[in-house]
């Protein structure tokens, strides 16, 4: 049931990266507008979007309060200009999205190597901790404050001179790895959460060489 | 139900060239590292090398480095090992296995193997 | 590379014995190995990772540990499907390395 010349919304999909997270549906409105209901599977239905003509609805304040909680969102479809108005059954026309659990299913955003430090025949690399929207105490927590060991980086380094890429994994944001004296390395990093099935890794971060600025060396 | 599958062994003469696939259903590869292991007869396990397909990166063993490459069509969901210029020493049982990437685990399932036997 | 030096190559023992299995790594390499179980014409099978942590479904009387650079594989009591050979496997670092295997014969 639903409201003479309004359709209901399809492809509800969820877009999250690093709990960064947004509804979005189709189709674009001709003369109806949408509001977007958010909920846990045990809470109360809240409204967010109200009467928009857009077709994506940031939920990002709303699942960051439980990353670890499975949330289900819903839009409703009204006539643009009669948004009291009701189908025949009482209620707006609605379609429901698919269950979004944001810990199990945030996109983990590409990482950035921080810096690289030679001393001797070690390199230290550091990953930046990216900061994410979820809150604890009103301070936005780091993504390593949020997964913890679930999340783990590879590091990909090989010679200048060289194609194949040698790894490293960690459980912190740091790495030290051996390298030959006098050879340039580039390396490349990637997030991964190893429990997942999906969603699993990121894309990786962007190379970065030695002798490039970032990186800093010592002899000893 | 996760599952590799190897394929394309035989038998092949000492230059010529081979192509083993490993087939893997139950996980998506672009996901995981998939990694070759080879195993001669009556010996141990010897790593081959390995390709992140979400990146196409790879690395090798010196005994087959510039003589093997390793490959992925994720769309199949199908790793590769190219061998050319094979050798009576290559001969062995190959073996494809699923990296995690984790900190903690290394090669979690494991093709059933297919055999390699280079001779004139 | 990471030599893995497993010792020792092989063992004969008797259903109920307690069986020891070492792999020492020719430097650090955190809690990165792994242990293996394979039977002839067979793939190897993940019990242990690392270093200390039962693989899922692989049965208690299996334990690791690590000291330093040594690693042990234990059977606390060999049972007749136990009969195989065991590998341990360092992923610390590129390439991975493999142990020579154990071989663990029935007395």
């Known amino acids: 049931s639903g409201t003479t010349n309004t359709v209901a919304a399809y492809n509800l999909t969820w877009k999250s990266t690093n709990f960064k997270t947004i509804l979005e549906w189709e189709p674009k409105p001709v003369n109806q507008v949408y509001t977007v209901q958010i909920s846990t599977k045990s809470g109360d239905w809240k409204s967010k979007c109200f009467y928009t003509t857009d077709t994506e609805c940031d939920l990002t304040d709303e699942i960051v309060k439980d990353v670890k909680q499975t949330y289900l969102a819903r839009v409703f479809s009204y006539p643009a200009g009669n948004v009291e108005s009701t189908g025949s059954a009482g209620e707006p026309l609605y379609e429901n999205s698919p269950e979004f659990t944001p810990y199990l299913e945030t996109n983990l955003g590409q990482p950035t190597i921080q810096s690289f430090e030679q001393v001797g025949t070690k390199v230290n690399v550091t990953v930046e901790d990216e900061r994410t929207l979820v809150r604890r105490n009103n301070t936005f927590l780091s993504l390593r404050d949020v997964f913890g060991k679930d999340l783990i980086y590879t590091l990909y380094y090989w010679k200048s001179s060289s194609s194949g890429k040698k790894t490293a994994k960690t459980n912190t944001n740091e790495f030290l790895i051996d390298v030959d004296k006098g050879e340039n390395y580039c390396f490349s990093v990637q997030a991964v959460i190893p429990s997942r099935t999906v969603n699993r890794k990121s894309t990786d971060s962007p190379v970065e060489c030695m002798g490039q600025e970032k990186g800093e060396f010592r002899e000893i | 139900e996760v599952q590799l599958v190897e394929s394309g062994g035989g038998l092949v003469q000492p230059g010529g060239s081979l192509r083993l696939s490993c087939a893997a259903s139950g996980f998506t590869i672009s996901d995981y590292v998939i990694h070759w292991v080879r195993q001669a007869p009556g010996k141990g396990l010897e790593w081959v090398g390995y390709?992140?397909?979400?990146?196409?990166?790879?690395y090798y063993a010196d005994p087959v480095k510039g003589r093997f490459t390793i490959s992925a069509d994720t769309s199949k969901n199908t790793a590769y090992l190219q061998m050319n210029s094979l050798r009576a020493e290559d001969t062995a049982v190959y073996y494809c296995?699923?990296?995690?990437?984790?900190?903690?685990?290394?090669?979690?399932?494991w093709g059933q193997g297919t055999l390699v036997t280079v001779s004139s | 590379d990471i030599q893995m030096t497993q010792s020792p190559s092989s063992l004969s023992a008797s259903v109920g014995d307690r069986v020891t299995i070492t792999c020492r790594a020719s430097?650090?390499?955190?809690?990165?190995v792994a242990w293996y179980q394979q039977k002839p014409g067979k793939a190897p099978k993940l019990l242990i990772y690392s270093a200390s942590f039962l693989y899922s479904g692989v049965p208690s009387r299996f334990s690791g540990s690590r000291s330093g650079t040594d690693f042990t594989l234990t059977i606390s009591s060999l049972q007749p499907e136990d009969f195989a050979t065991y590998y341990c496997?360092?992923?610390?670092?590129?390439?991975?390395?493999f142990g020579q295997g154990t071989k663990v014969e029935i007395k």
């Open positions: 496997q360092q992923h610390y670092t590129t390439p991975p390395t």
């Open positions: 430097q650090d390499v955190n809690t990165a």
């Open positions: 296995a699923r990296d995690p990437q984790s900190f903690y685990i290394a090669f979690d399932y």
């Open positions: 390709i992140d397909p979400s990146n196409g990166y790879t």
